[in-house]
């Protein structure tokens, strides 16, 4: 028979979990793990199960996004009696199993973190020997990726009536505050667009009317750092063009 269950227990246990006759399926994961972009994170996951001393074939799986249906980011399989879980899938080669599934530990290391990794992850184990059973974390662990600001685009664009406007887009977590400085501007917070749908870490600030030639600097700052980039506006007076 095959059973798919959802867990009710999802608290981080720091101790290794071993089966006893009365144990049921459960998974222990922390609600959230935080790490900086570019660094590594560990997604802890331990489990208990009712199949005492199970040493048959098993598969360990991690998904992203949603339980049961989300895309797999990691999968490994251990043969009967083997302590080695052979990796079959590691998305972009950045997911590595730290735990030993034979010791009820599916903990995963994620390397070279990017802001796009900021999502929820779900661990799952499948037994496929004499016993056929499987279990998956329902609530999962949220990986919160933080990042110092990075300006991803800065540009000057034409606007109606031979005027020009400047756009600055930056990413970071927490989302950075943007400020423009330049000729006759002082420090201006400008018009900041809220993060775009599906681009939660991107913030854009617009300077709607550039009235003077010269250097315009966009500064992005959050609690982890700051970044700045500049554009230059030189208009050919008497003509409708500009050099930036």
């Amino acid at each position: 028979f095959v059973r798919t269950k959802i867990d009710t227990t999802e608290n981080l246990l720091n101790t290794e979990v071993h089966s006893s006759p009365a144990q049921r399926w459960s998974m222990q994961v922390p609600p959230e793990v935080s790490a900086e972009a570019g660094d590594a994170a560990v997604l802890p996951c331990t489990f208990t199960h009712p199949h005492r001393h199970y040493d048959g074939p098993l598969t360990a799986i991690w998904r992203a996004g949603e339980p049961y249906a989300g895309p797999q980011v990691f999968r490994c399989a251990a043969a009967r009696g083997s302590e080695l879980c052979q990796t079959a899938l590691s998305l972009h080669g950045r997911f590595r199993l730290l735990g030993n599934p034979r010791r009820n530990d599916l903990s995963l290391r994620v390397e070279r973190l990017a802001l796009a990794d900021d999502r929820r992850y779900f661990c799952r184990v499948e037994f496929a020997g004499d016993v056929h059973d499987r279990y998956e974390s329902r609530h999962g662990v949220r990986l919160h990726v933080t990042a110092a600001p990075r300006i991803v685009n800065i540009s000057v664009l034409p606007s109606p009536a031979h005027a020009f406007r400047a756009l600055c887009t930056a990413e970071g977590e927490p989302p950075p505050a943007l400020a423009w400085s330049g000729p006759a501007l002082g420090n201006s917070l400008a018009a900041v667009r809220s993060p775009r749908e599906g681009h939660g870490h991107l913030v854009t600030a617009e300077l709607p009317a550039l009235t003077h030639d010269g250097r315009y600097t966009c500064t992005a700052a959050n609690s982890l750092g700051r970044s700045e980039a500049s554009v230059y506006l030189f208009r050919f007076h008497g003509a409708s063009g500009a050099s930036t």
Partner: antibody, heavy 121, light 110 residues
Framework: EVQILETGGGLVKPGGSLRLSCATS????????MNWVRQAPEKGLEWVAQ??????????FYAESLEGRVTISRDDSESSVYLQVSSLRAEDTAIYYC????????????WGQGVMVTVSL | DIVLTQSPALAVSLGQRATISCRAS??????????IHWYQQKPGQQPRLLIY???NLASGIPARFSGSGSGTDFTLTINPVQADDIATYFC????????TFAGGTKLELR
């Protein structure tokens, strides 16, 4: 029984190059990452390079102090790993060990007996 | 790079407890996992893995060896010390690349 055997060491002149080889047996080579670690005479250990396996796209990593002068490679069909070192300097004189590591951990669970490389006029 | 520091030598008596320390220049622990590993090296031999991830005994290593610690401070304990344990002991970190070793602690008989 896991066996790791390094060859290719010897005396090399400064500025020269050499290729170290590491033959393995007793385990499924494809399932592991392979590394080179060196130890200068009467000194500590220094990690040199790592090559991951096929699932991990044969990614390579190098110690900054050697970047650009070393290349690690592997041949899964031969269960072997290689280290090419160029522009050799006196400070590259060391015992070079070939080591195995699990895909989940950058620690070295098996080591070869090492091969001596001496860089001298 | 993460710098690991060990004291160069430790004198012990046979049958006693030996405690070898390793200090990291920054934390090597993430979410309860400590990326510190211990090796033993005898003269003329290759190193041998003793402990991985701070406290896990490697295959075939006697139970008199144990490891502990978290964050930046780690300890390898040998209890009781036997004559066969006279060697140099190295810690290594894999928290961040490049993976680095400490200079080693030479265990000597008092």
């Amino acid at each position: 029984e896991v066996q790791i055997l390094e060859t290719g060491g010897g005396l090399v002149k400064p500025g020269g190059s050499l290729r170290l080889s590491c033959a393995t047996s007793g385990f499924n080579f494809n399932d592991y990452f392979m590394n080179w670690v060196r130890q200068a005479p009467e000194k500590g250990l220094e990690w040199v390079a790592q090559i991951r396996n096929k699932i991990y796209t044969y990614a390579t990593f190098y110690a900054e102090s050697l970047e650009g002068r070393v290349t690690i490679s592997r041949d899964d069909s031969e269960s072997s790993v290689y280290l090419q070192v160029s522009s050799l300097r006196a400070e590259d004189t060391a015992i070079y060990y070939c080591t195995r590591s699990l895909t989940g951990g950058d620690y070295f669970d098996y080591w070869g007996q090492g091969v001596m490389v001496t860089v001298s006029l | 790079d993460i710098v690991l520091t060990q004291s160069p030598a430790l004198a012990v008596s046979l049958g006693q407890r030996a405690t070898i320390s390793c200090r990291a220049s920054q934390s090597v622990t993430i979410s309860g996992y400590s990326f510190i590993h211990w090796y033993q090296q005898k003269p003329g031999q290759q190193p041998r893995l003793l402990i991985y991830r701070a406290s896990n005994l490697a295959s075939g290593i006697p139970a008199r060896f144990s490891g502990s610690g978290s964050g930046t401070d780690f300890t390898l304990t040998i209890n009781p010390v036997q004559a066969d344990d006279i060697a140099t002991y190295f810690c290594q970190q894999s928290r961040k690349s490049p993976w680095t070793f400490a200079g080693g602690t030479k265990l000597e008989l008092r």
